[in-house]
Amino acid sequence: AADSNPRGVSAYLSRPSPFDLFIRKSPTITCLVVDLAPSCGTVNLTWSRASGKPVNHSTRKEEKQRNGTLTVTSTLPVGTRDWIEGETYQCRVTHPHLPRALMRSTTKTSGPRAAPEVYAFATPEWPGSRDKRTLACLIQNFMPEDISVQWLHNEVQLPDARHSTTQPRKTKGSGFFVFSRLEVTRAEWEQKDEFICRAVHEAASPSQTVQRAVSVNPGK
Amino acid sequence: AADSNPRGVSAYLSRPSPFDLFIRKSPTITCLVVDLAPSCGTVNLTWSRASGKPVNHSTRKEEKQRNGTLTVTSTLPVGTRDWIEGETYQCRVTHPHLPRALMRSTTKTSGPRAAPEVYAFATPEWPGSRDKRTLACLIQNFMPEDISVQWLHNEVQLPDARHSTTQPRKTKGSGFFVFSRLEVTRAEWEQKDEFICRAVHEAASPSQTVQRAVSVNPGK
């Protein structure tokens, strides 16, 4: 099958993040090849489109891992309209030691759509942590699973490194859920005690975003 | 190195779950071997203890995966006292196609200890889902990362399949956090509107458990 693996080497092809697709409007897809043995010839990653139309210029990155293997990524900018209209993109991986080329393809997810529900909570004061609180955001029942999560404070988007968001998991029903966790300081909540958890998802209307505000001292 | 992998085959050795260790008091450890090519000779998994003392009888399971590879697990019951006192257990994996044996070892995690903080929240009613609510539990700032999460209703532990709990992730500080999500029905909360999220962790006192109650209709 086109998507089977020669043993020991894996290739993955991502879809654009909803944030890049709908907010930044500069979507990219990434072809990731892992577990390559280094110094065994060059890995070639070649992009194509099912429509036969030309592809943009891609960016390549090689990284040697701690376990001695090589990871190669190639990032391809795609057209917002092309992606939304269902274009399929292929990444072909060749290497002297691979018995055959690895082929990966990606396209917009098919199937039913459902907008996310967003809920945000603040933890109460905990002994010994008076000047720190944790905010939690539960985003659930969305389909498909592609979602971007952001936190905002006073209309400023906080850096992604500030929060930790889980990978989408299946609910008992047909949708998906994620949790996001943000630690905030007293200085932040006393500046302005309103933090916003925002989900970017294709089924959300209007403008592909749903958000919920949360305060450390609610009702105050 | 003892823990390096022949390419394409991986072995993992788990620690006992805190629930098995402290509540059931029948801890087990599992040696998991993945990505084996089937019908290429027998895989042997052999257990030993660093102290040289004998090991209990282990249980073996083989499973063919969708991608055509074979997964082999061996589960070994260990003594609660032996584990707590720091015994090291080894799993040795041999196979005709492996250039050398795979060795994995496990022992009680060293380093600082911190008890979990447990916070539980209920989602408000969402249009179109009047007879269902989601409960969320944030468990954080614990060390080491080994934790078991349970939900209880009417003093009865709900089956693990009822909830979805994330893998431990690092906080900004030195500890770890997990989220757990439980869907409950109107029939359940109208029977008794109190659900308990319980964390089992070695640093929790007393009796290695910390819990928090949550209601769908608080203060009603």
Partner: antibody
Framework: EVKLVESGGELVQPGESLRLSCSTS????????MSWVRQPPGKALEWLGF??????????EYSTSVKGRFYISRDDSQNILYLQMNTLRPEDGATYYC?????????????WGQGTSVTVSS | DIQLTQSPASLSASVGETVTITCRTS??????LAWFQQRQGKSPHLLVY???ILAEGVSSRFSGSGSGTQFSLEINSLQPEDFGTYYC?????????FGAGTKLELK
């Protein structure tokens, strides 16, 4: 209507102590952080410090110019804010305002009292 | 501590005119800036907070703008009650500090 009424300002000698009070009405005092701000004659405003609400353990913050000499406290049962001023200096002479901090923007202030005058002179 | 520099220190204007007062901060305070008006012999009165949010009951002739380190307060169609001293104050962190003031006088 939010009302803040300061009292206790008077003429004192350097080195003496003085306690100012601020009676409040028209809002739920217990919910709010409360500040003191002063203004020497013909000069700019200077923030002295604030006290947090009960939910935030009544903790206090002070400007470096008064830290260790001035102490803010509150009596939630009477809706009164206090400023205890010790070891007063001539440069402490000013109009002292009791000020309510905003909700949500806790470092911002909204309502001010009419002020009470303190003179420090020998 | 964050320093606030107001300019001009004083200005004269006539009723009906539009004036702008600026406040520069010594470090980035995002939008955490408030403006107060103080009439002669009276207490200060909050006009604007979070750079641009008008306080309750304040005339829409007042408008605040800016972020980072540069802020301004604009007063349109000056009225007799607008004359006095205007102060900016950051509400970004502790200690809270005020500008030295801008005295707006009737020409």
């Amino acid at each position: 209507e939010v009302k803040l009424v300061e009292s206790g300002g008077e003429l004192v000698q350097p080195g003496e102590s003085l306690r100012l009070s601020c009676s409040t009405s028209g809002f739920t005092f217990t919910d709010y952080y409360m500040s003191w701000v002063r203004q020497p004659p013909g000069k700019a405003l200077e923030w002295l410090g604030f006290i947090r609400n009960k939910a935030n353990s009544y903790t206090t913050e002070y400007s470096t110019s008064v830290k260790g000499r001035f102490y803010i406290s509150r009596d939630d049962s009477q809706n009164i804010l206090y400023l205890q001023m010790n070891t007063l200096r001539p440069e402490d002479g000013a109009t002292y305002y009791c000020v309510r901090n905003k909700k949500v923007y806790y470092y911002a202030v909204d309502y001010w009292g009419q002020g009470t005058s303190v003179t420090v002179s020998s | 501590d964050i320093q606030l520099t107001q300019s001009p220190a004083s200005l004269s204007a006539s009723v009906g005119e539009t004036v702008t007062i600026t406040c520069r901060t010594s470090e980035n305070i995002y939008s955490y800036l408030a403006w107060f008006q103080q009439r002669q012999g009276k207490s200060p009165h909050l006009l604007v907070y979070d750079s641009k949010i008008l306080a309750e009951g304040v005339s829409s002739r007042f408008s605040g703008s800016g972020s980072g380190t540069q802020f301004s307060l604009e007063i349109n169609s000056l009225q007799p009650e607008d004359f006095g001293t205007y102060y900016c104050q950051h509400h970004y962190g502790i200690p809270l500090t005020f500008g030295a003031g801008t005295k707006l006088e009737l020409k």
